[in-house]
Structure formats: structure tokens, C-alpha cells
């Protein structure tokens, strides 16, 4: 229903706390360089204005759209052109073009320093002094680094953060209470960020239909007892929620997500037997819980689907009459039978089925043509299964760090032109798939591995789009989203690449490396490994292992030495010489 004042409507629905949080996230995701204080001031002004509209919906400007109100605020920021360059040109446009322009200027890799966590005492002091400001800083810092972070989910993580600080700041040993808990939240939030970015990419590049197909597959796996009409309704609603968040309409997105959660909890009987625990929780926790609820028990006696989709004489007639509905039903029926497949795989199978019908229904004898379609799925199913087996075996043998290094070598050989920091980030993220997925039960491994890899590779594509350097990467990134992972997996050594000349300074290290945290040490070593591969793309695994073991030994020796600086300056050049010889 239409409201006289959109801003009053959203303020009333969301309540002041969530309203302010979402406005802060929106501003931080649009203008990623502004300080917290600048944004906090804008948020307060918008909130005060919303309150006047709640009191009187006919007050001046209360009838304006949220895009108009927010855009006007952003465009009134002093020194916009000095700080944001051509983004200021967006302000010369009218809505809806102005908002589209803002969206296009979101930066997936902003040049901001890493978000450093203060030490425990300092954190607890500032949290106790002003919890609201502390949480505001958290929302601002995460949102500006992750401009597509799913806003209502970010509110959930802020709530988690709040609960952890409340608990741990009351403990004697704050540090050992905070560190593992906050690390856990950070890890989950980072995964949430890449997953949501993938959804927005799907929406931006391929439209709502592509996202809805993803949603149908995912929901059918999770709710195999729900009928097709129910799955379609949930997929349609979920598509709307994600479209709004990806489009910067965060107040509408959060409001609609709350509505969807309410609907699911009121209709558990027709959706799933597993929802009650989630539905007992407060709003943010409830919506989060529903988004990752365990799969319902599969029905006991689902028939084979060949009867309706291959053997039925009316297949082409049914397909021609309502293509999307017919394909949607196929995707639903296949997905509810296969919670052990990744969504990407299910979408590839549906795409193959669609292509087969397009071809066969135009022929003289369609049934003879499409009769073998389900058997033709087998290689498509075996490929990711083999990928999971091979990679999980390797992970179990090497551990996370060794597995990351193996992936780093592989991907540097596939795309040596890509910048070393991007390769290291990608390999470290791809390597975490082992820890995340390989320890799961057999039937959960494939969906975990492939859908996570797809999300990480989406980020590789986004970073590469900014500065395209590798034809291999461009080729894999320009295809459909679901074909990306198989495309990257199939890449081999880039034969067109001219090896980098050996620069001693790339492999020269100083004693400051000794005091770095373990993670930073690993990144330094992995940076060196990528550079070695760029110098010798065809180096064998044994050669690289020899060099890396030597390197690790060198660091260990010099970091234990009484005079570290002397050790690094004398042993360093020897290491470089040995490396050159080992790779000759």
C-alpha cells in the first residue's frame, strides 16, 4: 500500500535504532572515504527529519522518495569533488539516474587501511563509555570496506559484537575472552560479505531471473517438503529483498526481510519442520537463523523425475506453453532430491536441460533427441565431485597453510599477470575452503566447497575488472556466473606469459618480519612464493618446496639470532643465490 511519507513509514516499521543503523550503513557504503563523524552527523539529521515526518506526514519534503532525500544529503557534503572526484558528477543527475550513478561508483577494493582491532582494555573502555558510538564505528568501518554487505545482516553482526563485548569486558582476562569470539564473528562476516557480493553480481549482470533461479534451487534443497508454489513465493520475496539491498534501498530491504521472516514463521506447516527454533528468536537473530537453517528431512518416497521431464510425450508442449514455469519446476524437483549438490551445479544441470529442449523441440522427433538428457548430466556431476575429492585429499595432507600455497602456485601459473596481492588474497581465501568444508559429512562437502569457491572467484573477477591484465581471467569472468568455477579449474599454465626477471630485492627480507603476527608472516612468505612462480612459471612442485623450506629455515634461524640485522644482511644474499640455483 502507498504511504504519504516513505521515510515516516520506514522509521515506524524499523524503530529508531535499526533505522539509524541502516542509514549509517547506506551512507558509509556510498561515500566510503568519509569519516565516522561526518556520517554520524548526516544520520542524525536524517533521523531528526524522519521524526518530523512521523509527527506530520504532510510536513515539507516528507513525501519525497528515500533516494531523493538521501541523495540530496550526500550531494550537500562539502568538498565532494576534492574527495570523490567524478562521483560528484552524479549530483548533476536526477533520480533514478543519480542513485544508479552512486551505485556504479561503489569501490569493491577501497584504498583504506585494514580494520585494526584495538587491544582489549582500550576496546572495553570505549565500549563502556559509549556503546552506541562504539557500534556506530563498527558499522561504519565494515560498511565502507564492504559496500555490498547485506545491511540487515550487518546489524546482526553488530548485535553479536555488542553481546561479546558486554560479556567479555566483565571478565578478568578480557583478551582471551574477546579474541576467539571476535575472530569467529569476523570470519563469518567476511564469508557473508563475499556471498552477498556474489548475489549482487548475479543481480547486476544477469538480472532478477538469474537470482530467482538461484533462490529456487537453494530453497528447494532446504525445504524439500514445500510445494512448488510455496518455493516460488519464497523465491520471489527473497529476490525482492536482495534486489533492494543490492540497489542501496536498505530500509526497504530490512523491512521486507523482516516481513519474509514473519511469513515463514507463520507458515511453518507448509514450509519446513525445522523452523521453530529460529522463530522463537528476536528479529535479527531470527532472520539470520532462517537464512542458514538446516535442511528439512527429505520426503521418503520421491519418484524419479524422468516421467515428467523426459518420458512424457507432452514435454515440448509443456515447455513451449510456459518456459520459465516448466524449467522452474524441473529445477525445484531436481534440487529437492539433491541437497548434496551445489546450487551452481544444479543451475548448470537446469541450463543443460533448457539447451537440450531448445534444440530438440525444434527437431522432427523430439523425444528421441532429448531422451538421453539425464544421462548426459553425469559428467557435469562427476566433475565437481572429483574436484572436491582431489582438493580435500590435498588439504588433509598439507593442512590449511600448505593447501593455500598449493592453490597459490596453481593460480599464479593460470594467471601470472594478476597482481601478487590479489593472487595471495585469492589463494588464502580459496585455501580456507578446506577448513570450512572438508571436515563436513560427505553429503555436505560439495555444496559447501563449490558455492564458497564461486563466491571467492566472483571477488577475483570484480578486482580484475578494475584493471584487466589476464586474458585467461577475462575469459572465465565474462561467462555465466555458474560456469566460472569450472572455467577457472580448467585453466592451465598461461603459455603466453613472459616470465618476470629475477629481482633480488623482491626476495630480500629484514628483521622486522620477526615481530609480525603469524598471519602477516605467512602473507610475506606467500608473496615471495607467488613472485617465484612469476619468475619460473614452470618450476616443479619439488623445486618450489625446496626454495620455500630453505626460506622458512632462513627466517627461523635469523629470527632466533642474537644479532638479527646482521644475520638478515649476511644470510639473505646467500638465500637469494641458493634460490636462483635451485630454480635454474
Amino acid at each position: 500500500e502507498a504511504h504519504k511519507s516513505e521515510i515516516a513509514h520506514r522509521y515506524n516499521d524499523l524503530g529508531e535504532q535499526h533505522f539509524k543503523g541502516l542509514v549509517l550503513i547506506a551512507f558509509s557504503q556510498y561515500l566510503q572515504k568519509c569519516s565516522y563523524d561526518e556520517h554520524a552527523k548526516l544520520v542524525q539529521e536524517v533521523t531528526d527529519f524522519a521524526k518530523t515526518c512521523v509527527a506530520d506526514e504532510s510536513a515539507a519534503n516528507c513525501d519525497k522518495s528515500l533516494h531523493t532525500l538521501f541523495g540530496d544529503k550526500l550531494c550537500a557534503i562539502p568538498n565532494l569533488r576534492e574527495n570523490y572526484g567524478e562521483l560528484a558528477d552524479c549530483c548533476t543527475k536526477q533520480e533514478p539516474e543519480r542513485n544508479e550513478c552512486f551505485l556504479q561508483h561503489k569501490d569493491d577494493n577501497p584504498s583504506l587501511p585494514p580494520f585494526e582491532r584495538p587491544e582489549a582494555e582500550a576496546m572495553c573502555t570505549s565500549f563502556k563509555e559509549n556503546p552506541t558510538t562504539f557500534m556506530g564505528h563498527y558499522l561504519h568501518e565494515v560498511a565502507r570496506r564492504h559496500p555490498y554487505f547485506y545491511a540487515p545482516e550487518l546489524l546482526y553482526y553488530a548485535e553479536q559484537y555488542n553481546e561479546i563485548l558486554t560479556q567479555c569486558c566483565a571478565e578478568a582476562d578480557k583478551e582471551s575472552c574477546l579474541t576467539p569470539k571476535l575472530d569467529g564473528v569476523k570470519e563469518k562476516a567476511l564469508v557473508s560479505s563475499v556471498r552477498q557480493r556474489m548475489k549482487c553480481s548475479s543481480m547486476q549482470k544477469f538480472g532478477e531471473r538469474a537470482f530467482k533461479a538461484w533462490a529456487v534451487a537453494r530453497l528447494s534443497q532446504t525445504f524439500p517438503n514445500a510445494d512448488f508454489a510455496e518455493i516460488t513465493k519464497l523465491a520471489t520475496d527473497l529476490t525482492k529483498v536482495n534486489k533492494e539491498c543490492c540497489h542501496g534501498d536498505l530500509l526497504e530491504c530490512a523491512d521486507d526481510r523482516a516481513e519474509l521472516a514473519k511469513y515463514m514463521c507463520e507458515n511453518q506447516a507448509t514450509i519446513s519442520s525445522k523452523l521453530q527454533t529460529c522463530c522463537d528468536k528476536p528479529l535479527l537473530k531470527k532472520a539470520h537463523c532462517l537464512s542458514e537453517v538446516e535442511h528439512d528431512t527429505m520426503p521418503a518416497d520421491l519418484p524419479a523425475i524422468a516421467a515428467d521431464f523426459v518420458e512424457d510425450q507432452e514435454v515440448c508442449k509443456n515447455y513451449a506453453e510456459a518456459k520459465d514455469v516448466f524449467l522452474g519446476t524441473f529445477l525445484y524437483e531436481y534440487s529437492r532430491r539433491h541437497p548434496d549438490y551445489s546450487v551452481s551445479l544444479l543451475l548448470r544441470l537446469a541450463k543443460k536441460y533448457e539447451a537440450t529442449l531448445e534444440k530438440c523441440c525444434a527437431e522432427a522427433n523430439p523425444p528421441a533427441c532429448y531422451g538421453t538428457v539425464l544421462a548426459e548430466f553425469q559428467p557435469l556431476v562427476e566433475e565437481p565431485k572429483n574436484l572436491v575429492k582431489t582438493n580435500c585429499d590435498l588439504y588433509e595432507k598439507l593442512g590449511e597453510y600448505g593447501f593455500q600455497n598449493a592453490i597459490l602456485v596453481r593460480y599464479t601459473q593460470k594467471a601470472p599477470q594478476v597482481s601478487t596481492p590479489t593472487l595471495v588474497e585469492a589463494a588464502r581465501n580459496l585455501g580456507r575452503v578446506g577448513t570450512k568444508c572438508c571436515t563436513l559429512p560427505e553429503d555436505q562437502r560439495l555444496p559447501c566447497v563449490e558455492d564458497y569457491l564461486s563466491a571467492i572467484l566472483n571477488r577475483v573477477c570484480l578486482l580484475h575488472e578494475k584493471t584487466p591484465v589476464s586474458e585467461h581471467v577475462t575469459k572465465c569472468c565474462s561467462g555465466s556466473l555458474v560456469e566460472r568455477r569450472p572455467c577457472f579449474s580448467a585453466l592451465t599454465v598461461d603459455e603466453t606469459y613472459v616470465p618476470k626477471e629475477f629481482k633480488a630485492e623482491t626476495f630480500t627480507f629484514h628483521s622486522d618480519i620477526c615481530t609480525l603476527p603469524e598471519k602477516e608472516k605467512q602473507i610475506k612468505k606467500q608473496t615471495a612464493l607467488a613472485e617465484l612462480v612469476k619468475h619460473k612459471p614452470k618450476a616443479t612442485a619439488e623445486q618450489l618446496k625446496t626454495v620455500m623450506d630453505d626460506f622458512a629455515q632462513f627466517l627461523d634461524t635469523c629470527c632466533k639470532a642474537a644479532d638479527k640485522d646482521t644475520c638478515f644482511s649476511t644470510e639473505g644474499p646467500n638465500l637469494v643465490t641458493r634460490c636462483k640455483d635451485a630454480l635454474a
Partner: nanobody, 115 residues
Framework: QVQLVESGGGLVQPGGSLRLSCSAS????????MGWYRQAPGKQRELVAS???????HYADTVKGRFTISRDNSKNTLYLQMNSLEPEDTAVYYC?????????WGQGTQVTVSS
Amino acid sequence: QVQLVESGGGLVQPGGSLRLSCSASGSIWGIYHMGWYRQAPGKQRELVASITVDGSTHYADTVKGRFTISRDNSKNTLYLQMNSLEPEDTAVYYCDIRNVGGDYWGQGTQVTVSS
């Protein structure tokens, strides 16, 4: 071509136990359902127990607590452990394996519970 072979049936006294096996040969991929069905003389074939790809098990009310279904993925084999057998369990037991493309049935193995 997929072939399913059941074994382990036989004559047993009431209160006794049997373990049925069903092994699949040939190429069957993408299995989402494995089940045991039975058919007593003059009756419809009925589901006894099934196990889905996610490991969920389902049992007919009449066998709950007495029968246990399990599978060995590496051997493509399905089992049915039957304890506390009753004369009403007398039937031909069939195993059924499904992927989206088809429904594969064994020839059946006779189970007779009688004193």
C-alpha cells in the same frame, strides 16, 4: 545397465534376526534414494525403510524400533538389519535405488517368519 542383487533372505523363527544386503553393479550415479520395500501374497508392495542422500531414514510404523536401514557408499551396497521378526513380516523384500533418471529394482529375496 544397472543391476541390483538382494541376498540374506530365508526362513527364520519369530523373534529371530536377518540381515538383507543389496548390491548394485553397473553405473548408477546421482543416487538420491535407497529403500527396501516388501510385498506379501495378495497385498500391495509397501515401503519398509528408506534412506535419502542426506542420510535421513524413514521407517514404516510397523517396523520402527525393530529394523535398521544402512548403506555403504564405497561398496554401493544397501542393508536392512531385521530384529524381533514377526510372522507378519513374511514377504518378498525388494531393494530400490533411484536417481532422477530412473527407478532401479532388484529381483527380490524371500523372508519367511514361521515356527
